[in-house]
């Protein structure tokens, strides 16, 4: 019996087609992805093959103005239109709190939404009961397939699930649910979830009875053969893991942003054992036409976005200096504003010992592309912020050793004075540079804001200590020459859309007046 698994993950609000780098589509003839194009390909496969499942491994939420405006209603609407068969909850599904998951998505989705390792307690338990499930058994042709879900247990540090959801260890939670499926005589089981490629592989290895793992969170690109675009494969597709009980378990992921549609064919014997698995992600490029009915629907929903872009988010009573002349040479108040917003967006009081789990932000000055003039009645709009942060990136959470941070700050000024983008703006950090010293030895003082303290204060950076830092995904991926971050980071969790972070902060503060306050000094 043959099953075709079509899968997406980490779509992050890319409902419209995008450029090759998943930013806003500029030249339509070269654009990729989007739900209209995805639907064309899915329908083509559904017509050609008998047993097809369309699955999503989480993080549909967060990433573009679509999510900012529609807050998840767009996800439910277009996933329903594409007739997804099941979805696992990702960490970003909790970005607007549990209410922001229940109302727009859980109550509106016409497909099961899954996670076996999230347990509700207190008053939330009855409110959310039955709206998401640990697993679902789906009839496919004359057979049944069990789908069991899982979600990163780090979600309380990455999003806003509140205090009434407990995120258990994935493997511990999955095993009894898979055992239960076995008692129902379900012998074909897919683990669908959002904990990253390393955990996907562990689940394949450790959870008895799982036949296939379809993952997300780490934006992992797997490919067999010559890759069709810029993404470099982390391994073959599918990636085969040998389980502890000796089975070959295929593990797949399909990069992110709806650029690819994962396509995996599995052959099962009559006892539900995987005999063979093969496939590849399908690049959704312009050779695949956009479905006209879905496209028309997108255009209808788009109207509200255009209106939103020009609405006032808040006011500034000071000039927001985002000029290259400032932000690539010295502390600039636009950099301070953005970093303050990044920290504020990551406030998670999850432990009495810590006032917060993260206190530090770094931001490449070259990523700040425009100032905002306060003389326009002080009004700040999404459109204004899109000029400041035009790349559609995310502000991510990483863990780094102090020694890596020190290297990053040395890199920040290694060729100072040439208006290059690697000059770092900061939050929760005090740095002093001496430019008279040779490159690689110019950081003379680097103090960081404590987290395990009731009264935050600045302490010298410790080289061997592990720190959490919020930074643009561009830096986490080694951009602007920050190879040491990419090479040495100990953990990387993708965060919220950059503009969304800043716009939310401005809306919250209502009136802003960021200053230059001595975060970056030259001796």
């Amino acid at each position: 019996w043959e099953l075709t698994i079509l899968h997406t993950n980490d779509v992050h609000s890319r409902l419209e087609q995008t450029s090759e780098d998943s930013s806003k589509c500029v030249n339509a003839s070269r654009c990729m992805g989007g739900v209209a194009r995805l639907f064309t390909k899915v329908q083509q496969i559904r017509r050609a093959e008998p047993n097809v499942l369309l699955l999503d491994a989480g993080d549909q939420y967060q990433g573009t103005i679509w999510f900012t405006v529609y807050k998840g209603a767009e996800v439910a609407h277009f996933m329903n239109a594409l007739r997804y068969d099941a979805m696992a909850l990702g960490n970003h599904e909790f970005d607007n709190g549990v209410e922001g998951l229940i109302e727009p998505l859980l109550k509106e989705a016409k497909f099961p939404i899954l996670s076996a390792n999230i347990k509700a307690k207190g008053p939330l338990a009855s409110q959310i009961s039955g709206l998401y499930l640990p697993y679902k058994v789906l009839p496919v042709g004359d057979e049944v397939v069990g789908i069991v879900g899982y979600t990163s247990k780090e979600t309380p540090f990455l999003s806003n699930p509140g205090t009434n959801l407990v995120f258990e260890d994935e493997i511990t939670a999955l095993q009894p649910e898979v055992d239960k499926l076995k008692t129902l005589n379900v012998n074909k089981i897919i683990a669908l979830g959002h904990s990253g490629f390393e955990m996907d592989k562990l689940i394949a290895q450790k959870v008895r009875g799982v036949d296939v793992v379809v993952g997300g969170h780490s934006n992992t690109f797997l490919y067999t053969g010559n890759p069709p675009s810029k993404e470099v494969p982390a391994g073959k597709y599918p990636f085969i893991v040998t389980s502890d009980d000796g089975r070959k378990v295929p593990v797949v992921q399909a990069y992110a942003f709806g650029k690819y549609l994962g396509y995996l064919k599995i052959e099962f014997d009559e006892r539900g054992n995987v005999i063979s698995s093969h496939g590849n992600p399908i690049l959704l490029n312009s050779s695949i036409p956009e479905d006209p009915s879905i496209k028309a629907d997108i255009n209808k929903w788009r109207i509200k976005l255009d209106n939103y872009s020009t609405q006032e988010l808040g006011k500034t009573i000071v000039y927001l200096d985002g000029s290259s002349q400032s932000c690539r040479f010295r502390e600039c108040n636009m950099g301070n504003l953005i970093c303050d917003a990044m920290i504020n967006n990551n406030l998670r009081h999850t432990d009495e010992m810590f006032w917060n789990h993260v206190s530090m932000c770094i931001l490449n000055g070259g990523g700040i592309r425009s100032p905002i003039d306060e003389r326009n009645n002080g009004t700040i709009t999404w459109e204004n912020l899109a000029a400041v942060l035009p790349f559609g990136g995310t502000f991510d959470l990483v863990q780094l050793k102090g020694s890596t941070l020190k290297k990053a700050f040395e890199h920040s000024v290694h060729r100072y004075g040439q208006s290059t983008g690697e000059f770092l703006q900061v939050g929760g950090i005090h740095v002093v540079y001496d430019l008279s010293r040779k490159p690689g030895d110019r950081v003379v003082k680097l103090d960081v804001l404590c987290t395990k303290c009731r009264v935050p204060s600045y302490d010298p950076l410790k080289m061997d200590e592990v720190y959490k830092v919020i930074l643009p995904n561009f830096l986490a991926n080694g951009g602007d020459g920050f190879q040491m971050i990419k090479d040495e980071l100990l953990r990387h969790d993708s965060g919220d859309q950059d503009i969304n972070v800043v716009s939310t902060y401005i809306s919250k503060m209502k009136v802003i007046y960021p200053a230059v306050e001595g975060r970056i000094k030259f001796s």
Epitope: A125, S126, P139, D142, E143, V144, P176, K180
Partner: antibody, heavy 119, light 107 residues
Amino acid sequence: QVQLVQSGAEVKKPGASVKVSCKASGYTFTTYNMHWVRQAPGQGLEWMGAIFPGNGHISYAQKFQGRVTMTRDTSTSTVYMELSSLRSEDTAVYYCARGDYDESYFDYWGQGTLVTVSS
Amino acid sequence: DIQMTQSPSSLSASVGDRVTITCKASEGIYNRLAWYQQKPGKAPKLLLSGVISLETGVPSRFSGSGSGKDYTLTISSLQPEDFATYYCQQYWSIPWTFGGGTKVEIK
């Protein structure tokens, strides 16, 4: 609306067999399990087994293994439960009940069929 | 097989009383518990599933709680139409098993 309509009461002699039918309407017959639950006079409820009409898959309670046969006819949306080698303690009301494939609680029940086993 | 022990087996109560029925499983059932109401000569009717999920049309005076092995059905204010027999059922492990029932009678 969902309806499960069962066949009428039966009186059987010990050692005989009985076949009870349950006709489903108001939902997609092939996507839910159909369970059989019996209740002896004045007693509690006892699960006998279930059939998944989609593929004919059956699971029986160990106690009834070898004596019970469940079948389905998808053309008429009907399931059948046959119990053989009847004895007096099989006197009971037999219910069919619909259940999700993956969570086997019973959201709709037939009206029940009284089977009396008496010599 | 998982044994479901229901208590009490019967109770007498008056209209307006708060009634609590307990159900204990012989092993953990991971919240896979349903409650049914049965009136004489009728088929059982599903009240709650997943411990706490009230079926459509079931009055909000019925509520469920519990976890692990121990579960409770509560009727906050007993109404005349609530006099019936109540059964719990586990659907964690085949064979699905029911409690022995609790008959709620008029005092």
